[in-house]
């Protein structure tokens, strides 16, 4: 068995029997742990720059008689690559520069083996190589460039951002990784807390409108900031964000715009803009008309993109009524920050003068449409009525009138070009056309381009100039065996006229047929009449056909009447009164047709 060399131990602690002895750059001072003593540690300085391999230490078995019978074997982290062992002597060397920040601890296992038999002379022994830190790493910020924002006008000491630098060196040993922050650029506006890296505002009333961007350079230095420490820097780009600390202001107190009187409602007539040094929603402006004679005539809307106030026409303008309007327009911030209200009202007003420009307008008729009436029996050149149009402009240019011939192709009407009197130029007939729709044109004499039109609706009034007549052609029959006073036909009449109180027709046999007639007419007083038999029985061989002349009269003024003929045939009928034959026997009564009813 082998024991760890007592000479290197701190006196006063018991020796623990060990198979392998570790000697060299080991720290064999015992550090007390709960279960055992830790002595199997080598310490190796990182970043060794010597020309030879760095000596780590020696493994030795007490069974080693120095005759080469034992072979020392190393396994574990970096064995055979970073760490090599002389298999005969047990000397361990590091072959490369070691970087603690890459790997701070290597755990290896050592064994002494009988070179001939391969038999281990004692159990495998584990040991640790700890890489001793040197200050070879500067603090590195987590970002090369930080971006941060803080509201303008913030109180001194307002948090802006925290920067963090990390140092890869050992934080548990010395001050190699103890980082202190300082500000290299950015005073007196900002400060940094040396321990935490928190950047705060350091100056009162930092105004974005004065300066928006700040570039702050922060240094992180290890060794607690002392001389010889390594350092790194970062840039912090700080932007002051806007707060509403500026009211809108009109650059001028009065604006003047012109608009033609013909501008329809909604027409933009001008733009006004209040400037606001703020940005974003803090620079949003609402415009309103607060006063002035144009309050009802104009509107103001806000263009959300340009933050301009657009003055628009609200109602129709009339140069002849009012030529100039004065408005008071107010610009205000909708988003107000209460803490800045002490700076004054966040609104401004300006006077807007709107000049209405005269437009040469066409003549205006006194009515939008004219409805006229004329009797259908009116003579040519009868005056129906008149139209009136006036030039609305201040000039009051004279107008002339004409009929649009496209609407009166038959030239039934005419107009006096001077006074607008409408008269007939042809005879009318209500029964042909009840309404005549024509268009009259009024044209400024001095400016024929300025014209306007108006519709004329002319109603033709009825005159009783048509006689009533049968509604249809009547041809009826009578049975030979008919009885007296039997109804054989009902008559109806029509009249093209349209009397105010309705039609009232009267029916009678013509005077020449009234005496000795075989039939009678019975007026029903409801604009119908019936034909009745006057005797019992008719002989078709004696008289096969009767022609009855019927006089129909109306009761209008002047009375109109006409005579219509009803044909009555004598027929042979069955006992139900159904017609069987209406043909006269030929040769017997060659003169079968008679007008004598």
């Amino acid at each position: 068995t082998l024991s760890t060399p007592l000479s290197k131990r701190t006196s006063g602690f018991p020796a623990k029997k060990r198979a392998l002895e570790l000697s060299g750059n080991s720290k064999n001072e015992l550090s007390r742990s709960k279960r055992s003593w830790m002595w199997n540690q080598f310490f190796l300085l990182e970043e060794y720059t010597g020309s030879d391999y760095q000596y780590v230490g020696k493994l030795h078995s007490d069974q080693d008689r120095g005759d080469g019978s034992l072979k020392y074997i190393l396994s574990g982290d970096g064995a055979g690559d970073l760490f090599i062992i002389n298999e005969n002597t047990g000397d361990i060397q590091a072959t490369k520069r070691l970087d603690r920040e890459e790997k701070p601890v290597y755990i290896l296992r050592a064994q002494a083996i009988n070179r001939r038999t391969g038999r281990p002379v004692e159990p495998e022994s584990e040991f640790i190589i700890k890489i001793h830190d040197i200050n070879d790493n500067e603090p590195i910020f987590t970002k090369e460039v930080y971006t941060a924002t803080v509201p303008e006008m913030s109180d001194v000491g307002t948090f802006v951002v925290q920067v963090t630098a990390t140092d890869a060196d050992d934080p548990t040993y010395g001050n190699s990784a103890k980082v202190v922050y300082s500000i290299l650029q950015g005073q007196p506006y900002f400060s940094v807390e040396s321990e935490t890296g928190i950047i705060k505002t350091a100056l009162l009333n930092m105004d974005r409108e004065n300066r928006e961007q700040y570039q702050v350079v922060i240094q992180a230095k290890d060794m607690g900031g002392q001389m010889g420490g390594l350092s790194g820097t970062t840039t912090v780009n700080i932007t002051l964000t806007d707060v509403n600390d500026n009211p809108p202001r009109f650059p001028q107190s009065t604006y003047q715009f012109k608009t033609p009187e013909s501008s329809p409602p909604g027409t933009p007539i001008g733009r006004i803009k209040a400037s606001d040094a703020d940005v974003g929603e803090n620079a949003e402006i609402e415009y309103s008309i607060t006063d002035g004679e144009g309050l009802d005539m104009f509107d103001v809307i806000t263009d959300q993109e340009t933050q301009e106030g657009i003055i628009t026409v609200k109602k129709l303008l009339d140069f002849e009524k009012k030529k100039v309007y004065t408005l008071k327009v107010e610009a205000s911030n909708p988003h107000v920050e209460p803490r800045f209200l002490y700076l004054g009202p966040f609104k401004d007003s300006a006077t807007v003068r709107i000049v209405v420009e005269d437009v040469d307008e066409p003549p205006v008729f006194s009515k939008l449409a004219y409805i006229l009436q004329i009797r259908e029996d009116a003579q040519i050149n009868t005056t129906i009525g008149s139209v009136t149009a006036q030039d609305p402009d201040a000039a009051r240019n004279p107008v002339k009138y004409s009929v649009d011939r496209h609407t009166d192709m038959d030239r039934i009407f005419n107009i006096d070009s001077g006074n607008g009197s409408i008269f007939t130029s042809k005879l009318l007939d209500r029964e042909t056309l009840l309404w005549h729709n024509i268009t009259v044109i009024a044209t400024e004499i001095n400016n024929p381009k300025q014209s306007s039109r108006v519709p004329l609706y002319i109603k033709v009034l009825d005159v009783n100039d048509n006689a009533p007549e049968f509604a249809e052609f009547y041809e009826t029959f009578v049975c030979e065996k008919a009885k007296a006073d039997q109804l054989i036909q009902t008559l109806r009449a029509v009249d093209k006229d349209d009397p105010y109180s309705g039609h009232q027709f009267s029916f009678s046999l013509a005077p020449e047929a009234a005496s000795g007639s075989n039939f009678t007419i019975q007026d029903n007083k409801d604009n119908t009449a019936g034909i009745l038999t006057r005797k019992n029985g008719y002989n078709r061989h004696e008289m096969s056909t009767y022609l009855l002349p019927v006089v129909i009269s109306d009761n209008d003024y002047p009375v109109q009447s006409s005579t219509g003929t009803v044909t009555v045939r004598v027929c042979a009928c069955d006992h139900h009164g159904n017609m069987q034959s209406c043909h006269a026997e030929a040769l017997i009564h060659p003169t079968g047709l008679s007008t004598g009813a």
Partner: antibody, heavy 117, light 111 residues
């Protein structure tokens, strides 16, 4: 590369002795052991013993204590095994080999010993 | 002396199949996690060739179809898949103590 060279055959009479050679090359002769192994025709393998050329120290199979003597000549990187009082039982193939941590990683081609009158 | 018993004495395996050879030691050949058992292949007229050392470590240049396992007294050599050229006699050997001893051998035939 490591090589162990042995003569192909030896023919000897009973009762006499024979000294077999094994010439090593391709490694540091004095740093590793040389072992000898016997194999009778159609039989298994028997370890005779080994020698450490760096010191001349030997390990023997007790069965061969009075039969085999192991020596080295470090100047010629050659190991020798002398077999004495030969009988027909000694007729076999004798291999030299390098024992590295208990395993024979390199072997000679073997010398066939025939003991016959 | 430590006696090594190999089984079977011979076996015939089809091409591509698995061959398993066992070696039992009369006492443990393991110490401190190291198993001092080694395996060799010998073809007629040739010296033995090291295949596996320390029970399970493949010697450089030996095909990966050879594998070893075991500890204490029981050890196994596996060949899978078996190839034509694997026809030979296989020996186990211990180096735990002097004298080093070999197993009696297992002859592998390919069907």
């Amino acid at each position: 590369q490591v090589q162990l060279q042995q003569p192909g055959a030896e023919l000897v009479k009973p009762g006499t002795s024979v000294k077999m050679s094994c010439k090593a090359s391709g490694y540091t002769f004095t740093s590793d052991w040389i072992a000898w192994v016997k194999q009778r025709p159609g039989q298994g393998l028997e370890w005779i013993g080994d020698i450490y050329p760096g010191s001349g120290r030997t390990h023997n199979n007790e069965k061969f204590n009075f039969k085999a003597t192991l020596t080295v000549d470090t100047s010629s990187n050659t190991a020798y095994m002398q077999l004495s009082s030969l009988t027909s039982e000694d007729s076999a193939v004798y291999f030299c080999a390098r024992p590295m941590l208990g395993r024979f990683d390199y072997w000679g081609q073997g010398t066939t010993l025939t003991v016959s009158s | 002396d430590i006696v090594l018993t190999q089984s079977p004495a011979s076996l015939a395996v089809s091409l591509g199949q698995r061959a398993t050879i066992s070696c039992r030691a009369s006492e443990s050949v393991s110490i401190h996690g190291t198993h001092l058992m080694h395996w060799y292949q010998q073809k007629p007229g040739q010296p033995p060739k090291l295949l596996i050392y320390a029970a399970s470590n493949l010697e450089s240049g030996v095909p990966a179809r050879f594998s070893g396992s075991g500890s204490e007294t029981d050890f196994t050599l596996n060949i899978h898949p078996v190839e034509e050229e694997d026809a030979a006699t296989y020996f186990c050997q211990q180096s735990f103590e002097d004298p080093f001893t070999f197993g009696s051998g297992t002859k592998l035939e390919i069907k």
